[in-house]
């Protein structure tokens, strides 16, 4: 567990008066339809709120939306609906906020049926001013910004045209027709699939994958017989129909589609799916659905090329295509992921990995909790985490697990303690060491958020009754204070804090309800006076991540290196501040066989760390296609785990084999590829 002085809960001094002086109410004069909230830029304090009240099949005078702007983190709002000419804004497109601190915003308006095209309102000054632009098409999707240049936008039209703007939506050009899906890649590249015959649905599995690197001046066909494609980290994936039957396979490219390799993954049939669960520049977590309507599949982890995959976890819960999976990247500690498995008896259990999918284990039982009715042995059980699947099943779980990169080691989640996830009302648990150990933090379901890089945790009880109390902790959830933020309770709908968990402001959203009137209301609480002083050196202590055995020289080694962090002491009540940067000291570890995965044609027998040749492949031409060409694959049977930084130690060298292979992929070989210019 992370360091913390075990002491009696001390009350934060005079906190009621301090918070009362920093609580700001805003009542919105709106019928309670829907509300959406967007932060514009980082550390700007600018929030846009769009309220809409819309009844289908009612003339436009009745559809109402209002736009509000705050520039002080939600303490005060100004009605700026007149800046968009009191136009009704389409909520299904949301507010398209530009990347980084571009200050750009695009709102898509509702237009009458007979119009030639849609209408957008554009701002490039953090929503201080808007320009109305009539479009030459009706948008089907929200405007998508290029990650590299926020002046470049793309959108699909209702007639499946791909439209691009080079001047932040001022002028639009249709660069291709019959487009199903389009995505920005790196360097302002656009990838998109096209259909030739009937429609996207009819041509599924016969789509072509195209690329343009110059915003539509020229194109290159980089794939045929495409079912779908996806981008993850530096990898471009395509699922491709097989020649002979209705199965499809994943192909991967690391050079923007110029060359492709067939991923060493099982093929899937019509009713199955692939899903990229997580990806970075090193590797990919890929889910492959089981045949039949099982609700589970297998997680595979890739090598650095995205080609060779190791089986990571069996019976991984993932309901249907685009359905629910509990797979969660714990962003507060490197290498940690949490997900759920469906066991043979159809119960759902939580598993955690601390080494990027190398090994999975159950979550340790919290010391202050009893095993529930699902446990066969009342002394031995695990913590099971509620995530997306529980939420989709309408269990009493208001929030998914929460972690933040700058709140090192902290994970907060709803859970139950037993042999499997329970349908009983869950409690809230916290880990301060990235998921190794857990403590019950709050009784019953709550909404929660992290402020000031972990210096404050805020929670609100999940209740069907109106609420007026907020809870907060300055010691990573050990002790809690309660603050009544309003005399008149409100129907609570959500907590909002600036993304990145650096802010000290929290907004409580809800609505008041009186006779035939319900109005949106927000309360923004600034905790700056609770954390009176800036943190100093003495407020921090050294913490070794992934530490399980302090006596061991290799303690804390994960993926070839260990990291020491400076962590805020639990007893310190001070501000990390908006400019807080996580201080960490990495040190390289010696290599062991655990730092290597088995290369293509090799596997690890159970309870053995050595890679041995797969018997069924001995003496066979391998169905393996590297870069779309027949060639020799040279391997020593081992490959360094992606992102592993170990040095020295074990160096698993064995005879280098030439694996003569036959390329059975029918995927584009370079000579089949064609280019064209507009």
């Amino acid at each position: 567990s992370a360091p913390g002085e075990d002491e009696e809960c001390g009350r934060v001094r005079d906190f009621v008066a301090k918070l009362a002086n920093n609580t700001h109410q805003h009542v919105f004069d709106d019928l309670r339809g829907s509300v959406s909230l967007s932060w514009v830029g980082d550390s700007t304090g600018v929030i846009l709120v769009l309220t809409t009240f819309h009844v289908p099949l009612v003339i436009m005078t009745f559809g109402q939306s209002k736009l509000y702007r705050s520039e002080d983190y939600g303490k005060n709002f100004k009605d700026i609906t007149d800046l968009i000419n009191n136009t009704f804004i389409r909520t299904e497109f949301g507010m398209a906020i530009g990347p980084e601190n571009s200050g750009k915003v695009v709102l898509t308006a509702e237009v009458s049926g007979g119009s030639r095209g849609g209408r957008i309102f554009r701002s490039s000054d953090f929503a201080k001013n808007f320009v109305q632009t009539d479009l030459p098409f009706h948008p089907l999707t929200q405007m998508m910004y290029s990650p590299q240049n926020s002046d470049y936008l793309l959108a699909l039209s209702t007639e499946n045209g791909l439209w691009v703007s080079k001047n932040f939506g001022g002028k639009w050009e249709e660069i291709h027709k019959a487009v199903c899906l389009a995505k920005w890649g790196s360097d302002n590249t656009i990838f998109f699939t096209t259909y030739a015959n009937g429609s996207c649905k009819a041509d599924l599995g016969a789509l072509e994958l195209w690329r343009t690197s110059d915003l539509g001046k020229s194109f290159k066909t980089i794939g045929v017989k495409i079912y779908s494609f996806g981008l993850g980290g530096r990898f471009l994936f395509a699922s491709v129909m097989a020649d002979k039957d209705t199965t499809r396979r994943i192909h991967v490219s690391t050079d923007q589609g110029d060359t492709w390799s067939m991923a060493q993954l099982p093929s899937v049939g019509q009713e199955q799916f692939y899903s990229i669960l997580a990806a970075n520049d090193d590797m990919v977590f890929m889910h492959v659905d089981e045949p039949g309507d099982t609700g589970f599949g297998t997680i595979f982890t890739s090598d650095d090329r995205g080609i060779v995959y190791s089986k990571s976890l069996d019976r991984h819960l993932y309901t249907t295509t685009g359905g629910e999976t509990d797979f969660t990247n714990v962003t507060s500690l490197r290498g940690v992921y949490i997900t759920s498995v469906l066991s043979e008896d159809n119960s759902i259990q939580t598993m955690i990995t601390f080494d990027q999918g190398g090994r999975w284990t159950h979550l340790r039982k919290p010391e202050n909790s009893e095993c529930d009715a699902t446990a066969k042995n009342k002394n031995e059980c695990s913590l099971h985490i509620h995530a997306s699947y529980s939420i989709s099943q309408k269990l009493n779980v208001p929030m998914a697990p929460l972690s933040e990169p700058n709140a090192v080691g902290i994970v907060i989640a709803h859970g139950s303690v037993g042999d499997a996830i329970s349908v009983m009302v869950p409690d809230v648990y916290i880990s301060d060491d990235g998921g190794y150990s857990w403590t019950k933090m709050l009784e019953g379901p709550h909404y929660y958020t992290i402020l000031d890089s972990g210096g404050i945790i805020v929670a609100i009880e999940h209740s069907s009754r109106p609420i007026n109390v907020i809870k907060f902790s300055t010691d990573e959830g050990q002790c809690w204070q309660t603050y009544t933020f309003t005399r008149d309770p409100i129907y609570f709908t959500g907590l909002a804090s600036e993304p990145g968990a650096r802010s000290m402001n929290i907004s409580i959203w809800g609505f008041t309800e009186s006779f035939l009137t319900s109005q949106w209301v927000s309360y923004t609480i600034d905790f700056k006076d609770i954390l009176e002083r800036n943190c100093e050196e003495k407020d921090y202590t050294i913490w070794l991540a992934h530490s399980t055995d302090p006596e061991d020289y290799e303690d804390g080694c994960i993926l070839g290196y260990k990291e020491q962090f400076l962590r805020l002491r639990k007893s310190s009540v001070c501000q990390n501040g908006r400019d807080y940067v996580v201080t960490k000291q990495p040190s390289i570890c010696l290599c062991s066989l655990e730092d290597f995965l088995c290369d293509f044609g090799y596997y690890r027998p159970e309870n053995d760390s050595k890679c041995v040749e797969q018997p069924e492949l001995k003496g066979h031409d391998l169905e393996f296609c590297l870069y779309g060409r027949e060639e020799h694959l040279t391997t020593n049977g081992y490959r360094k785990i992606p992102g592993d930084k170990c040095q020295g130690g074990v160096n698993p060298v064995r005879e280098v084999k030439d694996l003569k292979k036959k390329c059975t992929s029918n995927f584009l070989s370079p000579e089949k590829q064609n280019s064209k210019s507009n």
Partner: antibody, heavy 124, light 108 residues
Framework: QVQLQESGPGLVKPSQTLSLTCTVS??????????WSWIRQHPGKGLEWIGY???????YYNPSLKSRVTISVDTSKNQFSLKLSSVTAADTAVYYC????????????????WGQGTTVTVSS | DIQMTQSPSSVSASVGDRVTITCRAS??????LAWYQQKPGKAPKLLIY???NLQSGVPSRFSGSGSGTDFTLTISSLQPEDFATYYC??????????FGGGTKVEIK
């Protein structure tokens, strides 16, 4: 398109409790924009508002009926219900459920969707 | 309670006639007023909301005006399908909602 359908017994004995249910189809009762009302109409007479419920469970009743009325909501079934206790012959009427769109500080948006109505007779 | 007084209680008119129905509130109700049409054996149908806004799908020969205490429903050119009873309804800031007594539009 949202539709409302009343259901319940057509005949109730005096002093008993009248129970009706309104089933909402084509939309969610949990939409925070609407108020779910009961209105009745005595034979050959005008319309009388009984009360409404908000999805959160808060209710408002006509003061003239308040002591006898209970309106409840079951969001999981997409239904809301009316109970009127200690009925007499004066409660014989056509009972309608309706969706009320509420009001702002300036405007009232009216009851835009109604059930077809169910006739309840109070008689021994 | 706010009382809604509707007049006339009945009116006889011919196809093509202009028909005006008035509704008076016992105290000011801003634009918290709606108009409904009801045919025998049927549920009421919303015609006008917020005193003057035409509900979607309602013919433009129907119009509403007024605010405060005095409101008017006008049918500019009566059609055969318009013979029905018309009700005004107010929605105040405190309960109850009340309806006017109704105006029956009959064939002359």
């Amino acid at each position: 398109q949202v539709q409302l359908q009343e259901s319940g017994p057509g005949l109730v004995k005096p002093s008993q409790t009248l129970s009706l249910t309104c089933t909402v189809s084509g939309g969610s009762i949990s939409s925070g924009t609407y108020y779910w009302s009961w209105i009745r109409q005595h034979p050959g007479k005008g319309l009388e508002w009984i009360g409404y419920i908000y999805y959160s469970g808060s209710t408002y009743y006509n003061p003239s009926l308040k002591s006898r009325v209970t309106i409840s909501v079951d969001t999981s079934k997409n239904q809301f219900s009316l109970k009127l206790s200690s009925v007499t012959a004066a409660d014989t009427a056509v009972y309608y459920c309706a969706r009320d769109r509420g009001r702002t500080e300036s405007y009232y948006y009216g009851m835009d969707v109604w059930g077809q109505g169910t006739t309840v007779t109070v008689s021994s | 309670d706010i009382q809604m007084t509707q007049s006339p209680s009945s009116v006889s008119a011919s196809v093509g006639d202009r028909v005006t129905i008035t509704c008076r509130a016992s105290q000011g109700i801003s634009s918290w007023l709606a108009w409904y049409q009801q045919k025998p054996g049927k549920a009421p149908k919303l015609l006008i909301y917020a005193a003057s806004n035409l509900q979607s799908g309602v013919p433009s020969r129907f119009s509403g005006s007024g605010s405060g205490t005095d409101f008017t429903l006008t049918i500019s050119s009566l059609q055969p399908e318009d013979f029905a009873t018309y009700y005004c309804q107010q929605a105040p800031s405190v309960p109850p909602i009340t309806f006017g007594g109704g105006t029956k539009v009959e064939i002359k």
